[in-house]
Interface confidence: medium
């Protein structure tokens, strides 16, 4: 019955292609393990692994955890996509102050150009508002109301922009939940700097050092500190945790200020997909008869590249605790080896890097 | 026109073996994925293993794994799967069945019962 | 059991329309292509549906298929007695393949 997807008539000598006559062409077929990524891949790279949801493959081919824009002051810039991760931007009126990866540790309020001063540069997601000296021949009353907005009378904005952290709630760090007539609240109890008279409301020259925690003069223990769910990672920039939150994983590692949170599988499953701090694919733990046990075979045996087993299939079976419950998972790291031995006569080997998908095909990960 | 033809099945003790065979013919056999899925007796549908064209990987069930092994001849255009250590739930009627290129089951054998029985 | 969750059985009569579910998760049904199969008395299955919606030819149009997040749905109408049989749903992955419980459709 299926005589609209015949494969055979004109790639006949190459088993590696076939014949798709809803595009009267040869398509190059996927190596077993590997999914096309559009109808009629013509070469490797057009198959690939794919990652659980709300994971990304990145450039290491290891499925990454995307970050997560649940923050009140964060909006979704970029979604989540096979190969990059979710970006997060600060939301309207507010720029980032601290930087992280793909997303912004720390943002703040639009700061209000002051009486006498207007707008140079509107703020953005990214950088604050700048202003200049009025005109001469500017009004008071502005040409403009997008060139001059003017704080409530008897306040004077600052240099220094109100952040919104949901880890503190004094008045001068307040919630963003109240909307935009908050946010102009908070901008308009600003005063100004007196050193900076051309850019209200530039930030500090560090704005990542947290306000609760001074650097004294002279102390070398003076470090950034992230939001909450952030990290310090090794370049020094604020990085997003990875979220335990999918059933099948728990925490195993807090997120500390300099490492992230890792997460491991639930107990009675196993990592079969790895992915950074994380299971990108956990599968229930073989319970196996003594006779069943095998021994994973030597690795250097084998001559392709080792992939985890899909959902659906397991490790080599070890037995089960004397106390008939089966194992906790390994570490996030540690993933299981497909029994699969690809020959030499494969075209790639299972885990090349590979091409975007023009049909947005869901494929499925190799590991 | 595309056919598949299982045979091997029969009686046969627990912690005993069996070889099933699938005879393809039909289509270019070497440039196909195949696969074996059983279905025991007023049961579902099971997936058992699978294998790539060409001398490609080789991926089980969990429930099978360590126990059966699939493999393939082009030249004779035949898919195997030796069974070993058969367990009373191996039970069922076994299908050869070929992957389209994006691993739905195009066409199936009409299948090979196994009893695995004392 | 299956992780791919199916109602047990369906009915209609002829000339109704009936819809069977697939019940899955993000890890199956939520990030794969769904497929469906039909199982007629006493023989193996026939693919009837692949791609989450896609008609092999041969295939009737009363037979669609439609997926929403994590489930999936096969939707007859028009039924007919020739159409009392067992349908499969079927999750597809490189590396194994997940097929719902069944359901046995009756036609009344």
């Known amino acids: 019955f299926p005589q609209d997807r015949p494969f055979e008539d004109t790639c006949h000598g190459n088993p590696s292609h076939y014949y798709d006559k809803a595009v009267r062409r040869c398509c190059y077929r996927c190596p077993m393990g590997l999914f096309p990524t559009q109808q009629c891949p013509q070469r490797p790279t057009d198959c690939r692994k794919q990652c659980e949801p709300d994971y990304y493959l990145d450039e290491a081919d290891r499925c990454t955890a995307c970050v997560t824009c649940s923050r009140d002051d964060l909006v979704e810039k970029t979604p989540c996509a096979w190969n990059s991760s979710r970006v997060c931007e600060c939301r309207p009126g507010m720029f980032c102050s601290t930087s992280a990866v793909n997303s912004c540790a720390r943002c703040f309020f639009h700061s209000v150009c002051p009486a006498g001063m207007i707008v140079k540069f509107p703020g953005t997601a990214q950088k604050n508002t700048v202003c200049e000296p009025a005109s001469p021949g500017v009004s008071p009353a502005c040409a403009s109301p997008e060139n001059c907005k003017e704080p409530s009378s008897g306040t004077i904005p600052q240099a220094k922009p109100t952040p919104v952290s949901p880890a503190t709630s004094s008045a001068s760090t307040m919630p963003v939940r109240g909307g935009t007539r908050l946010a102009q609240e908070a901008a308009s109890k600003l005063t100004r700097a007196p050193d900076s008279p051309s850019s209200v409301g530039r930030p500090s020259s560090d704005p990542g050092l947290s306000p609760t925690q001074p650097c004294p003069e002279g102390s070398g223990d003076c470090r950034k500190q992230c939001e909450p769910d952030y990290y310090l990672d090794e370049a020094g920039r604020c990085t997003a945790c990875v979220s335990c939150s999918r059933d099948d994983l728990v925490e195993k590692t807090p997120c500390a200020w300099n490492s992230s949170r890792t997460c491991e599988c639930r107990p009675g499953m196993i990592c079969a997909t790895s992915a950074t701090n994380s299971c990108a694919r956990c599968v229930p733990y073989p319970i196996c008869a003594a006779e069943t046990v095998t021994k994973p075979q030597d690795m250097a045996e084998k001559d392709t590249t080792f992939e985890a087993p899909p959902l659906g299939t397991q490790p080599d079976c070890n037995p089960t605790p004397e106390n008939g419950e089966a194992p906790a998972s390994t570490s996030p790291t540690q993933s299981l080896l497909v029994d699969s031995q690809a020959s030499k006569t494969l075209p790639i080997p299972t885990s090349a890097p590979v091409a975007l998908s023009s049909t947005g095909k869901p494929v499925l990960d190799a590991g | 026109e595309v056919q598949l033809l299982e045979s091997g099945g029969g009686l046969v003790q627990p912690g005993g073996s069996l070889r099933l065979s699938c005879a393809a013919s039909?289509?270019?056999?070497?440039?196909?994925?195949m696969s074996w899925v059983r279905q025991a007796p007023g049961k579902g549908l099971e997936w058992v293993s699978g294998i790539g064209y060409g001398h490609g990987g080789t991926y089980y069930a969990d429930s099978v794994k360590g126990r059966f092994t699939i493999s393939r001849d082009n030249s004779k255009n035949t898919l195997y799967l030796q069974m070993n250590s058969l367990r009373a739930e191996d039970t069922a009627v076994y299908y050869c069945?070929?992957?389209?290129?994006?691993?739905?089951?195009?066409?199936w054998g009409q299948g090979t019962l196994v009893t695995v029985s004392s | 059991q299956s992780v791919l969750t199916q109602p047990p059985s369906a009915s209609g009569t002829p000339g109704q329309r009936v819809t069977i579910s697939c019940s899955g998760s993000s890890s199956n049904i939520g990030s794969n292509y769904v497929y469906w199969y039909q199982q007629l008395p006493g023989t193996a299955p026939k693919l009837l549906i692949y791609r989450n919606n896609q008609r092999p030819s041969g295939v009737p149009d009363r037979f669609s298929g439609s997926k929403s997040g994590t489930s999936a749905s096969l939707a007859i109408s028009g039924l007919r007695s020739e159409d009392e049989a067992d349908y499969y749903c079927?999750?597809?992955?490189?590396?194994?393949?997940?097929f719902g419980g069944g359901t046995k459709l009756t036609v009344l």
């Open positions: 069945a070929r992957y389209d290129y994006d691993y739905s089951f195009d066409y």
């Open positions: 039909g289509f270019t056999f070497s440039s196909y994925h």
């Open positions: 079927a999750v597809s992955s490189p590396y194994s393949y997940v």
